[in-house]
Amino acid sequence: IRAEKAMVDGSWLDLAKRSKLEAQPFAHLTINATDIPSGSHKVSLSSWYHDRGWAKISNMTFSNGKLIVNQDGFYYLYANICFRHHETSGDLATEYLQLMVYVTKTSIKIPSSHTLMKGGSTKYWSGNSEFHFYSINVGGFFKLRSGEEISIEVSNPSLLDPDQDATYFGAFKVRDID
Amino acid sequence: IRAEKAMVDGSWLDLAKRSKLEAQPFAHLTINATDIPSGSHKVSLSSWYHDRGWAKISNMTFSNGKLIVNQDGFYYLYANICFRHHETSGDLATEYLQLMVYVTKTSIKIPSSHTLMKGGSTKYWSGNSEFHFYSINVGGFFKLRSGEEISIEVSNPSLLDPDQDATYFGAFKVRDID
Amino acid sequence: IRAEKAMVDGSWLDLAKRSKLEAQPFAHLTINATDIPSGSHKVSLSSWYHDRGWAKISNMTFSNGKLIVNQDGFYYLYANICFRHHETSGDLATEYLQLMVYVTKTSIKIPSSHTLMKGGSTKYWSGNSEFHFYSINVGGFFKLRSGEEISIEVSNPSLLDPDQDATYFGAFKVRDID
């Protein structure tokens, strides 16, 4: 019986460990500063790091600028987007700005995109001021299915702060779908 | 065999409970208003409550103004920082402010500090306005090792809102490191 | 013994699945735009969706404008509140605004309300600008007891953005209370 119990315990430990790790995909993606689009229009950001500095990914996939869900579940999604401008980098096209982020979900089966979360602010960045900065943070709890894709859209991409501590987004699985 | 099964079940329940609690350190620390630094320069905030009001800590340590990780894992870290000024409390040194927060990680082994997250805004707080307020929220998912320390730096500490619902930071463990 | 082991495995799988699902209540509630209060004073928002679009709830209850906790535990709470104004919707009563959110907890046993989190900003929304927008995000980790209620208060409710991706709040259970 002891041997059998050890076998039970062993298989359970394996199962517990395996299921726990499988059940918890995550990603923390940081902006790839070498490839930030220019301009002031709303664009999808496609260049993110997934394996350097603070960036990491597990049981999810990063492809074509999108974070792909590999495992059904309820996830907490978040994004932090920083915008900045210093007068040494040239003049702003306009002093009245709409600095926004949109976290969107795309389903491959139904090729449509839906905004899960948005945030931001209208700003007056006077040319008289040497430096301007503004950050947006959004977060929420969403049901995601395998194959669905998460992407980030921003206005005024040329103003993005390229630091890894400034502009990033991520997700982690909290629980299974019943 | 029944007795043996009960023993298996019992030991498993203990193990499950124990491992679950051990696996989930957390902290929610609120600003200690009696010891906020003055001035407008960037400073590390070292006075936080960990055991009164909303503040709490478990399986992590608070020491010397830093939140110390006791258990390797992936954690969700967050901070909410509120700044405010009322004319009855005096004048502002300058109307152009950079209100910022930096969430930093320090490794004792390699005594260097790195910023995990930053947020904030440049603000024009006119001396003619009776009251000003601004809040920053940041959050993200990070791999933390036992012994690493999390701390909070802010600009303009004299403008911090001292309420426990206003200025706080925290962490909770989401999963083990594979 | 094999049959007994299968029984142990089976009961454990059931127990694991059951306890896991029971242990993880959550809610993501989105603003009900058909019933947003008017005015600029601080009000409690009572109309939220819990079962359409991104809105969902499990092992928690939504009643009388409040999110009711059914299960003791430590929860991560969050809120995202967007304010906006377009000149086509009329003039603002004042250009100087305090745009705020308060996440409050009410205990039925002790009928008192306490603010867990607050955020926001004072804003100057000039009548010369066509469009204004501002978002607030707050989040934190709190101990909640069964029967306690979470509600959202905002200033200037008439300026709320009624989109489901803009104005929402939620909670998910992270761990049991020891």
Partner: antibody, heavy 118, light 111 residues
């Protein structure tokens, strides 16, 4: 209570400099702008400038900018004003002052008479 | 610079009578929903004393017979029933923008 105590009267020759002091008490010296206002004999009030003693930020009326300096010593809770290249028309009572908790100049020093005469 | 013009330069009022002093600004002194105009009393040989702040607010300890009104560029100080101790010079001042400026003063004489 808030008090502003100024240094004594000064008699100066044209072209000289004068340095007046204003010791503050009853409030946190580093958190309010301290202002200087002068009044020539039989004339009205004239705002000259101010200092924020914390970081030492200053602001001046254009008229005085070139020959007027305001400083502060935080350790002594004292502000100073120095006026250079004195002329006879600089003869006046010089007041240091601070705004009230809301607005307006609610607190005034007793004034320092500066006489510029050959 | 914002120029403040007071009128009259002097006035003579009998005890118990109403006194009205006007102050006109060269540009608006309103911002953030408030008027940054203040009124002072100065008796001979004394420092000025704040009477009214933000156009219409009575400073603590000031008798209720003093009142202020106005917005943007036109402001008024009123003494509803003049008393002997009110004989002084009255100044308006703006601190909406640097440099802060004072009006030329109005000398009130009791008949």
């Amino acid at each position: 209570q808030v008090q502003l105590v100024q240094s004594g009267a000064e008699l100066k020759k044209p072209g000289a400099s004068v340095k007046l002091s204003c010791k503050a008490s009853g409030y946190t010296f580093t958190t309010y702008w301290l202002q200087w206002v002068r009044q020539a004999p039989g004339q009205g009030l004239e705002w000259m400038g101010a200092i924020y003693p914390g970081p030492g930020n200053t602001k001046y009326t254009q008229k005085f900018k070139d020959r007027f300096t305001i400083t502060a010593d935080k350790s002594k809770s004292t502000a100073y004003m120095q006026l250079n290249s004195l002329k006879s028309e600089d003869s006046a009572v010089y007041y240091c002052a601070r705004r009230g908790s809301r607005r307006g100049i609610a607190y005034w020093g007793q004034g320092t008479l500066v006489t510029v005469s050959a | 610079n914002i120029v403040l013009t007071q009128s009259p330069a002097s006035l003579s009022v009998s005890l118990g009578q109403r006194a009205t002093i006007s102050c006109r600004a060269s540009e608006s002194v309103d911002s953030y929903g408030r008027s940054f105009m203040h009124w002072y009393q100065q008796r001979p040989g004394q420092a000025p004393r704040l009477l009214i702040y933000l156009a219409s607010n009575l400073e603590s300890g000031v008798p209720a017979r003093f009142s202020g009104s106005g917005s943007r560029t036109d402001f008024t100080l009123t003494i509803s029933s003049v008393e002997a101790e009110d004989e002084a010079t009255y100044y308006c001042q703006q601190d909406n923008e640097d440099p802060y400026t004072f009006g030329g003063g109005t000398k009130l004489e009791i008949k």
